[in-house]
C-alpha cells in the first residue's frame, strides 16, 4: 500500500519560516500534489500549493517556494512574517494524487523538541 | 473544442472480440490520463478500464480482467478498447472519457458513447 | 472498492423547487467527489468536482457540499433542462465508483 510522508522544519534563521517536505512511497506515477495547512483540503484545510509534474506549480501566500525534490518529492517553504504566518502547533498536510491507484495523504507539524524560541 | 469520438460498437456473438476506438481532438492528448466507462441498459456507470498519460499505468475492475486491455496511440490521439471473450453481460454503451487532474481525478470530457451488443 | 450510496434513487419535483441528492461513500474519500448529470441517450456531463466546485458553464444554481463520507448536490431552484439523472462520483480511490443514480422526474 502506499504511503505519504511529511516532515516539517522551523528555519533557525528566520523566524517562524516553515519548510515542509513531503514525499510518497508507491509504485504509481505522481498526477497531482496538494499541500494545504490547518488540515487535509477536503476537511476545513487551506491550499498552500498544487504541484503538477507537466503544468507546472501553483503557490499561495505565505508559501514562498514549492518545488519538487524527485519525482515523488516536493518541499515547500512558507514566509514567516505577516498576519497568516503559521505558527509553531499549525498542522500541515500532503495530498498525493497517484494515477490510476488514487489519493493519499499524511499530515504533520513541527516536533515538539522544536522551540520558536531557540530558532534565532 | 475538446471533443472525443468513440467508434467500433455492434452485435457480437458471446465469446467474440470487439475493438472499440476513441478520437480525442481539441487538446493535447499524451497529458492527460484516458478511460472507458460502460453503462448497461436502463442502469449505472461502471468504470471498465483506464490508462495512465504515459502509458505505463493501467485498471481493470475483475469484472473484465483478462478479457480487455486498454491502449493508447498518442500519434494518432487515439484510445483503444480491445474486448475479447464477450459475455451478454457486457451489452452496454460504452463511453471513452478524460481525466482532469486539477479537478481530482473528475471526468471532464465524454464521448457520445458507442453500443456494444453481446448476443446469439 | 469504495461504494457510493445515493438518496433517493427517484425524485419528482417542479419547477422552481429547491432539491437535494445525498451520497454517502463506504470510507472517507477526502474532498474527491464529483457529481454527474445525464439525459436519456446522451453522455454523462460533469457538473461539480472536489465537492463543491462548479464545472465551467455549469450554473450557480447547482451546488455541492460535504466532506468525508457525506456529500450533498443541491439543485436551488429547479428549471426545466434540470430534469435528469445525477451520479456521485468518487476518485479518491481506484475504482472510481459512481453512485446508481438519482432520476429526477417533473412532478
Known amino acids: 500500500t502506499p504511503e505519504v510522508w511529511v516532515q516539517v522544519r522551523m528555519e533557525a534563521t528566520e523566524l517562524s519560516s516553515f519548510t515542509i517536505r513531503c514525499g510518497f512511497l508507491g509504485s504509481g506515477s505522481i498526477s497531482l500534489v496538494t499541500v494545504s495547512w490547518g488540515g487535509p483540503n477536503g476537511a476545513g484545510g487551506t491550499t498552500l500549493a498544487v504541484l503538477h509534474p507537466e503544468r507546472g506549480i501553483r503557490q499561495w501566500a505565505p508559501a514562498r517556494q514549492a518545488r519538487w525534490e524527485t519525482q515523488s518529492s516536493i518541499s515547500l517553504i512558507l514566509e514567516g512574517s505577516g498576519a497568516s504566518s503559521p505558527c509553531a502547533n499549525t498542522t500541515f498536510c500532503c495530498k498525493f494524487a497517484s494515477f490510476p491507484e488514487g489519493s493519499w495523504e499524511a499530515c504533520g507539524s513541527l516536533p515538539p523538541s522544536s522551540d520558536p524560541g531557540l530558532s534565532a | 473544442e475538446v471533443q472525443l469520438v468513440e467508434s467500433g460498437g455492434g452485435l457480437v456473438q458471446p465469446g467474440g472480440s470487439l475493438r472499440l476506438s476513441c478520437a480525442a481532438s481539441g487538446f493535447t492528448f499524451s497529458s492527460y490520463h484516458m478511460s472507458w466507462v460502460r453503462q448497461a441498459p436502463g442502469k449505472g456507470l461502471e468504470l471498465v478500464a483506464a490508462i495512465s498519460r504515459d502509458g505505463d499505468s493501467t485498471y481493470y475492475p475483475d469484472t473484465v480482467k483478462g478479457r480487455f486491455t486498454i491502449s493508447r496511440d498518442d500519434a494518432e490521439n487515439s484510445l483503444y478498447l480491445q474486448m475479447n471473450s464477450l459475455r451478454a453481460e457486457d451489452t452496454a454503451v460504452y463511453y471513452c472519457s478524460r481525466h482532469e487532474d486539477y479537478f481530482g481525478f473528475a471526468m471532464d470530457s465524454w464521448g457520445q458513447g458507442t453500443l456494444v451488443t453481446v448476443s446469439s | 472498492d469504495i461504494q457510493m450510496t445515493q438518496s433517493p434513487s427517484s425524485l419528482s419535483a417542479s419547477v422552481g423547487d429547491r432539491v437535494t441528492i445525498t451520497c454517502k461513500a463506504s470510507?472517507?474519500?477526502?474532498?474527491?467527489v464529483a457529481w454527474y448529470q445525464q439525459k436519456p441517450g446522451k453522455a454523462p456531463k460533469l457538473l461539480i468536482y472536489y465537492v463543491s466546485n462548479r464545472f465551467t458553464g455549469v450554473p450557480s444554481r447547482f451546488s455541492g457540499s460535504g466532506s468525508g463520507t457525506d456529500f450533498t448536490l443541491t439543485i436551488s431552484s429547479l428549471q426545466p433542462e434540470d430534469f435528469a439523472t445525477y451520479f456521485c462520483?468518487?476518485?479518491?480511490?481506484?475504482?472510481?465508483?459512481f453512485g446508481q443514480g438519482t432520476k429526477l422526474e417533473i412532478k
Open positions: 470510507q472517507s474519500v477526502s474532498n474527491d
Open positions: 462520483q468518487q476518485a479518491y480511490r481506484s475504482p472510481w465508483t
